[in-house]
């Protein structure tokens, strides 16, 4: 089983938006949800 880390560095690239993974609760943005570390 893959373990999920909030700082995994996962990026979402679609519709010309890029959400860079940061720690949950960071001051970088709001948690998008249902992904790994995505904030915006």
């Amino acid at each position: 089983d893959a373990e999920f880390r909030h700082d995994s560095g996962y990026e979402v690239h679609h519709q010309k938006l890029v959400f860079f993974a940061e720690d949950v609760g960071s001051n970088k943005g709001a948690i998008i949800g249902l992904m790994v570390g995505g904030v915006v």
Epitope: A2, V12, L17, G25, A30, I31, M35, V36
Partner: antibody, heavy 121, light 111 residues
Framework: QVQLVQSGAEVKKPGASVKVSCKAS????????IHWVRQAPGQGLEWMGF????????NYNQKFKGRVTMTRDTSTSTVYMELSSLRSEDTAVYYC??????????????WGQGTLVTVSS | DIVMTQSPDSLAVSLGERATINCRAS??????????LNWYQQKPGQPPKLLIY???KQGTGVPDRFSGSGSGTDFTLTISSLQAEDVAVYYC?????????FGGGTKVEIK
């Protein structure tokens, strides 16, 4: 406790616009994006998009071709979804929702109670 | 856009028996060994509730009789021993790419 409370039912004529609100409480408003999902009567679920209360950035389902606008008011912890150029096929229950990211041990979802929007001449 | 297809459309199962729902994605919903596939339960007049995330992980407070399996494009939700309170419509959803998309739903009833 986390709560998402939506505005009441609306009846609109074709071509009009509707603005549905979703008031968040029980957590820090700016830490979670708010998504909108709709469900036509007797039909399935359709994701419309989300907005970030932190940045104001939104991402919309292109199916709605510029008809949808999602905004937020941080002073009242409220997110709004406006849908314009309404047609009968837009008759649906509109839900706002908040989701955790994938994490070890927990993922929670929270949903508003739903707002029925009826489009009829 | 990723298209999610569920089968069957409806399912009648006896109390205590197993219920199996299938979901197929038009392309892989995997990324870096994680399947971005979620399952929801919706009862009449209520919003959906997250049951399973990342294909196999149980949501908070979800009974152990609900389990998920699969990867890539093919996924399954299993209710190991159907209870009366499990009567609902079940949806799969992908969160790999925007726009997020849902399957058409599977209605589970008591036989």
């Amino acid at each position: 406790q986390v709560q998402l409370v939506q505005s009441g039912a609306e009846v609109k004529k074709p071509g009009a616009s509707v603005k549905v609100s979703c008031k968040a409480s029980g957590y820090t408003f700016t830490t979670y994006a708010i998504h909108w999902v709709r469900q036509a009567p007797g039909q399935g679920l359709e994701w419309m998009g989300f907005t970030s209360p932190y940045s104001g950035v939104s991402n919309y389902n292109q199916k709605f071709k510029g008809r949808v606008t999602m905004t937020r008011d941080t002073s009242t912890s409220t997110v709004y979804m406006e849908l314009s150029s309404l047609r009968s096929e837009d008759t649906a229950v509109y839900y706002c929702a908040r989701f955790d990211n994938y994490a070890r041990g927990y993922v929670r979802d929270y949903w508003g109670q739903g707002t029925l929007v009826t489009v009829s001449s | 856009d990723i298209v999610m297809t569920q089968s069957p459309d409806s399912l009648a199962v006896s109390l205590g028996e197993r219920a199996t729902i299938n979901c197929r994605a038009s392309e892989s919903v995997d990324n870096d060994r994680i399947s971005f596939l979620n399952w929801y339960q919706q009862k009449p007049g209520q919003p959906p509730k997250l049951l399973i995330y990342a294909a196999t992980k149980q949501g908070t407070g979800v009974p152990d009789r609900f389990s998920g399996s699969g990867s890539g494009t093919d996924f399954t939700l299993t209710i190991s021993s159907l209870q009366a309170e499990d009567v609902a419509v079940y949806y799969c959803q992908q969160s790999k790419e925007f726009p997020w998309s849902f399957g058409g739903g599977t209605k589970v009833e008591i036989k």
